[in-house]
Interface confidence: low
């Protein structure tokens, strides 16, 4: 359990940099995370909206706080989900 947990952690932390990448090859991963963010009402992997770097400006409603009952914060003038997605992803992987 702890070993697999460590591998998942490392993989997610490693993949955080893909969110701020601008190449075509990273787009699929970015789009998967966008869908996950909307489903689980979270933002980014480790550092929240900052994980997206300049891509935050290219996706007009990235992390948009639709359900304001959930914790939200202001980032670059937009209301975004405060919670990062890493714990949700780990839970999701553990259950599936």
């Amino acid at each position: 359990k702890s070993k697999s947990d460590r591998i998942v952690n490392e993989t997610l932390y490693e993949n955080t940099k893909l969110l701020s990448a601008t190449g075509e090859s990273e787009k699929q991963f970015q789009e998967a995370i966008i869908v996950f963010q909307e489903e689980f009402k979270c933002c980014g992997l480790v550092n929240g909206a900052a994980d997206w770097g300049n891509n935050f400006q290219h996706y007009p409603e990235l992390c948009a706080c639709l359900d304001k009952q959930r914790p939200c914060q202001s980032y670059n003038g937009k209301q975004v989900y405060k919670e990062t997605c890493i714990s949700f992803i780990k839970d999701f992987l553990a259950k599936n």
Epitope: E38, E61, K68
Partner: antibody
Framework: QVQLVESGGGVVQPGRSLRLSCAAS????????MHWVRQAPGKGLEWVAV????????YYADSVKGRFTISRDNSKNTLYLQMNSLRAEDTAVYYC??????????????WGQGTLVTVSS | EIAMTQSPATLSVSPGERATLSCRAS??????LAWYQQKPGQAPRLLIY???TRATGLPARFSGSGSGTEFTLTISSLQSEDFAVYYC????????FGQGTKVEIK
């Protein structure tokens, strides 16, 4: 200036279908979330559905879930509401409205004049 | 679903007088509340958003206040064009409207 013009309303029998359209102009349609809001004769306002700027996310009121479908064509600056399995209680003026944001997660800032849908046998 | 309750259902006021309309949410909606005005045969029009911010071009006689669950729309000196139905709407968790307050001439 922002203009929202609804069409497609009319009289329809219970159980039948109808599709409403909303032609938008005076703003960058593809940047805004859009809602449908309805008002039964002599009654208050009821939120029906919302669609994000890019059509990716859609949300519905429980009263219409599974029967109504909201969609948009950004190339035509048009919003749609496909209404199936219509019931008498769906009789209302249907307003096409614009959200202040792209995600359709904020307040409604512009309204069309509405189109009347009457469900009656 | 967050329920919005407006009171009174009807408010009878003389022109020039002050009108105070109330709106209560079943749970906190922070400041995510808007007010709309609707005249007979017309579409609603945005008056206030963020509980207290006036929409562009709205006269200063209209003001909104409150946060959490209790909100107020005040019209300081009613003009003939202000007699209408007023709705509050929360956008904190999806969207729900109050049932409306009709402001009529006394």
């Amino acid at each position: 200036q922002v203009q929202l013009v609804e069409s497609g309303g009319g009289v329809v029998q219970p159980g039948r279908s109808l599709r409403l359209s909303c032609a938008a102009s005076g703003f960058t349609f593809s940047s805004y979330g859009m809602h449908w809001v309805r008002q039964a004769p002599g009654k208050g306002l009821e939120w029906v559905a919302v669609i994000w700027y890019d059509g990716r996310n859609k949300y519905y009121a429980d009263s219409v879930k599974g029967r109504f479908t909201i969609s948009r064509d950004n190339s035509k600056n048009t919003l749609y509401l496909q209404m199936n399995s219509l019931r008498a209680e769906d009789t209302a003026v249907y307003y096409c409205t614009r959200d202040h944001s792209g995600s359709g997660s904020y307040y409604i800032d512009y309204w069309g004049q509405g189109t009347l849908v009457t469900v009656s046998s | 679903e967050i329920a919005m309750t407006q009171s009174p259902a009807t408010l009878s006021v003389s022109p020039g007088e002050r009108a105070t309309l109330s709106c209560r949410a079943s749970q906190s909606v922070s400041s995510n509340l808007a007010w709309y005005q609707q005249k007979p045969g017309q579409a609603p029009r945005l008056l206030i958003y963020g509980a207290s911010t006036r929409a562009t071009g709205l006269p200063a006689r209209f003001s909104g206040s409150g946060s959490g669950t209790e909100f107020t729309l005040t019209i300081s000196s009613l003009q003939s064009e202000d007699f209408a139905v007023y709705y509050c709407q929360q956008y904190n968790n999806f969207w729900t409207f109050g049932q409306g307050t009709k402001v009529e001439i006394k």
